[in-house]
């Protein structure tokens, strides 16, 4: 109707990076920018994705290099993390959130795709990492190996081989395992501290240079106490599981101290594995019963999990696998191993800023049934799996509903702010829920809408619209972009109007009657008043229209509702040649060229497009007859 299609600003970017997948208008002290997501952007050797800031009038885009942001204390994998897949602007302070839902980190032998987001302040500086689903690895362990190096240990090389082989089984790295080694006889020494080495390679190299220190006495209690009171302190990490491995070949010369030493280890929650090497006893034909009892006393209960004995030093190699497996069986404690909580949650697949924080869709949470998490300045709220059961019953738990594919919120005069999330795969037809979140990790689900057609992806896009700008939501629009009709993937946008406390279905928006795939409703944007009639408007994207060139539809708001026939359809082909997937993202909240009119930003494959609004001239005709 009044969007200019003759002089758009087409901002080019990388097609392979999918520059344009997301777009947001941005204002810094009166300077206007587009923030553009490129989720397949490369940083060095990794396809991390990234975000660009693009000047509105002229000039080139600048990469923000958010793909280089690293989280300390985790072994992260940023390749294919899809940074920029979702963007959310906070209009209060003009900061924004850029999410990497496929960001993952190494935990033992697994990679957990928890997702993470970067908060960027109004002047495009990274300020904070938001990763509410990130949990400590079960391999977040500080392991101290307490080695008997007294004279009776022979040959030392076998002890060294054992040490190297067990170290090779450990997942050493940030956020995972740290290893320290102490050697004792009459005295105790640090061979290396917990935080001296950060990789298996470095630890193994250090271990290969440990020499036997000797000693006529075996002060095992002192060695254990030294490990507890010193080795776990020097480089030890708060919250890390403390594991001690004691390897000795004889009764201790300070066994009367063991009771107190073990009590203190218990108090410090140190899990103790103890290995009795019987070489000295077997070589001399001595009964090892007293020795074995002592080693069992040192080992944590139950003995069958924590105590080992080997016939001699050479046999140490035979327990490497068993010891490693027992240590890592700590990983799965009290866990149903076939089930995922937040480990694969893909948090940040969608994002939405609310007054007290940000909502993040986590489609992979709870075995891909999905969830919505909330991060606030006061902490995070992660609803329990059970809190969704009312609308996502147990019998459908293996269907992968993908709740959190999109998130938004509505405001009703009675209930205040209510959150909205889409689950486009729920029972194959899709579902949208409206809910409030509580600090005790429960939800109250107020309403649910269900899709009609299998595979339509109902709920993959949701937008709330305050038509008259009174602060209360008037309309909720739900996209089902894969809705199949007349032999094609046409797409559909459902209209729900707020009546008292409930949203009531009120038809669908009309698209064009072309006979190709369109995916109408892939993106739906609530935009500020485009046609200067004081009602806010809606723009819907159909990125597959015109043979994947794409198109957008502009619908005008009117008296608390929305007019279901588009006032303007803009196709990619009328703007520039070569545009593809035009309409995959839309944002329209700012006047970008200072003419007093709201302008549109539209994403395409490898491009961001700015469409300028033109003024609307209201002509009021009045007839005067003279003489009357």
């Amino acid at each position: 109707f009044n969007m200019d299609t003759r002089k758009p600003r087409v901002i080019p970017g990388s097609r392979t990076a999918f520059f344009g997948y997301t777009v947001q208008q941005h204002d810094i002290s009166g300077n206007k920018w587009l923030v553009v997501g490129a989720p397949l952007e490369t940083n060095g050797y990794q396809k991390t994705g990234d975000v660009y800031k693009c000047p509105v009038i002229h000039g080139n885009c600048t990469k923000l290099n958010l793909g280089r942001v690293t989280l300390s204390n985790v072994s992260e994998r940023k390749d294919n993390m899809r940074l920029g897949l979702s963007l959310a602007t906070n209009p209060k302070d003009n900061s924004f959130l850029a999410c990497s839902p496929l960001w993952s980190h190494e935990c033992g032998s697994s990679y957990y795709t928890t997702g993470m987001c970067s908060r960027v302040n109004s002047n495009f500086r990274f300020s904070k990492t938001v990763a509410p689903a990130l949990q400590r690895c079960q391999t977040y362990m500080d392991i101290v190996i307490v080695l008997d190096g007294s004279n009776s240990i022979y040959p030392w090389v076998e002890v060294q081989h054992f040490l190297i082989n067990i170290l090779k089984k450990f997942y050493i790295g940030p956020g995972q395992i740290q290893v320290g080694v102490v050697q004792y006889g009459e005295d105790v020494v640090h061979e290396f501290h917990l935080n001296d080495y950060r990789s298996v390679k470095d630890v193994v190299e250090a271990a290969s240079h440990i020499e036997q220190r000797g000693g006529t006495e075996t002060r095992t209690a002192f060695g254990i106490e030294f490990a507890r009171s010193e080795a776990f302190q020097k480089g030890g990490r708060k919250g890390a599981k403390k594991v001690m491995i004691v390897i000795t070949d004889g009764e201790s010369h300070d066994s009367p101290d063991l009771e107190k030493v073990i009590q203190q280890s218990e108090r410090d929650n140190v899990t103790r594995y103890a290995v009795a090497v019987l070489g000295y006893y077997n070589r001399r034909g001595i009964n090892p019963e007293t020795f074995l009892n002592e080693i069992k006393y040192i080992a944590s209960d139950p003995d069958d999990k924590h105590f080992f004995n080997v016939t001699d030093e050479a046999a140490l190699k035979d327990i490497v696998d068993a010891l490693g497996d027992r240590i890592f069986s700590l990983e799965g404690t009290n866990k149903n191993e076939t089930s995922f909580g937040l480990e694969m949650s893909q948090t940040g697949f969608s994002s939405h800023v609310v007054e007290d924080g940000v909502l993040l869709g986590a489609v992979g949470a709870y075995d891909w049934n999905g969830a919505v998490l909330k991060e606030t300045s006061a902490g995070k709220v992660i609803p329990l799996r059970e809190s969704y059961l009312k609308e996502f019953p147990e019998e459908l738990k293996n269907h992968g509903a993908y709740l959190g594919y999109t998130v938004t919120s509505v405001v009703s005069s009675r209930q205040g702010r209510v959150y909205v999330a889409g689950a486009p795969r729920f029972n194959h037809t899709g579902k949208v829920i409206l809910f409030t979140m509580h600090n005790n990790r429960s939800l109250t689900i107020h309403q649910a809408m269900r899709g009609q057609q299998i595979g339509s992806y109902f709920g993959s896009e949701i937008t709330s619209v305050d038509i008259d700008g009174d602060g209360v939501t008037d309309v909720l629009l739900v996209g089902a972009p894969m809705y199949f009709n007349e032999g094609r993937e046409r797409g559909k946008v459902y209209v729900y109007e707020l009546r008292q406390n409930l949203f009531v279905y009120n038809g669908t928006l009309k698209d064009s009657h072309s006979y190709q795939n369109a995916r109408f409703g892939s993106s739906i944007a609530s935009v500020r008043d485009l046609n200067q009639d004081s009602y806010n408007d809606v723009v819907v994207g159909a990125p597959l229209e015109d043979n994947h060139a794409g198109a957008i539809y502009i619908f005008h708001g009117f008296r608390g509702s929305i007019l279901k026939t588009p006032k303007q359809r803009i196709t990619a082909s009328e703007l520039a040649t070569g545009l593809q997937y035009f309409g995959c993202s839309i944002h329209g909240q700012l006047d970008l060229n200072e003419d007093g009119l709201i302008d549109l930003a539209v994403g395409a494959l490898g491009n961001a497009v700015i469409l300028w609004s033109r003024p609307v001239v209201q002509i009021n005709a009045s007839l005067h007859f003279e003489p009357s």
Epitope: E217, R219, A221, F222, E225, E251, S252, H253, D254, S255, P256, D257, L258, E259, K260, I262, T290, N293, E294, Y297
Partner: antibody, heavy 120, light 109 residues
Framework: EVQLVESGGGLVQPGGSLRLSCAAS????????IHWVRQAPGKGLEWVAS????????YYADSVKGRFTISADTSKNTAYLQMNSLRAEDTAVYYC?????????????WGQGTLVTVSS | DIQMTQSPSSLSASVGDRVTITCRAS??????VAWYQQKPGKAPKLLIY???SLYSGVPSRFSGSRSGTDFTLTISSLQPEDFATYYC???????????FGQGTKVEIK
Amino acid sequence: EVQLVESGGGLVQPGGSLRLSCAASGFNLDSSYIHWVRQAPGKGLEWVASISSYSSYTYYADSVKGRFTISADTSKNTAYLQMNSLRAEDTAVYYCARYWYYSAWALDYWGQGTLVTVSS
Amino acid sequence: DIQMTQSPSSLSASVGDRVTITCRASQSVSSAVAWYQQKPGKAPKLLIYSASSLYSGVPSRFSGSRSGTDFTLTISSLQPEDFATYYCQQSAPYSSLITFGQGTKVEIK
């Protein structure tokens, strides 16, 4: 030759204090444990306290807990028993003895004993 | 705490007699049980350690044995210098808490 010599005994009034010493020779105190054992006139042996000079861990009999303190000075190769709030029933001959790995945790060497009399 | 109950509290025997003294532990204990001999006005002397091992310099007529929670000191042929009081002592495992029996006085018949 291994030797333990106690000193510091004597007459003390109830509520008073006394410090007993046990000087060791012929071995290092920090490779063993020292125990104090007492014997009241005409009675049997009663264990009082022990210390590991190396780790400084201590143990006490319930009858003396909170009143007696065992300590050791490895540089002087001497153990001590500080006795406070003494009572008539603490009257006894006090022996120190060595306890270590090589005697399979038995008291293999004893001092000659020192008499402590608590009386008003 | 473990109690050591020693019996008998006294016995009369003649030179050449076989003498047996028993200590019963109130609960299952390790073999860290020792036996001492004490003569009037003297410090105790170690005879047996680890329930059955003879301490160096101690005559072989002294022996120790264990059966469950019962520990026995045997003097195979009593000699005049053996008239004394005998004590058993138990070491609590992995601590230096020790307990003595009440003692057995061996007198000349």
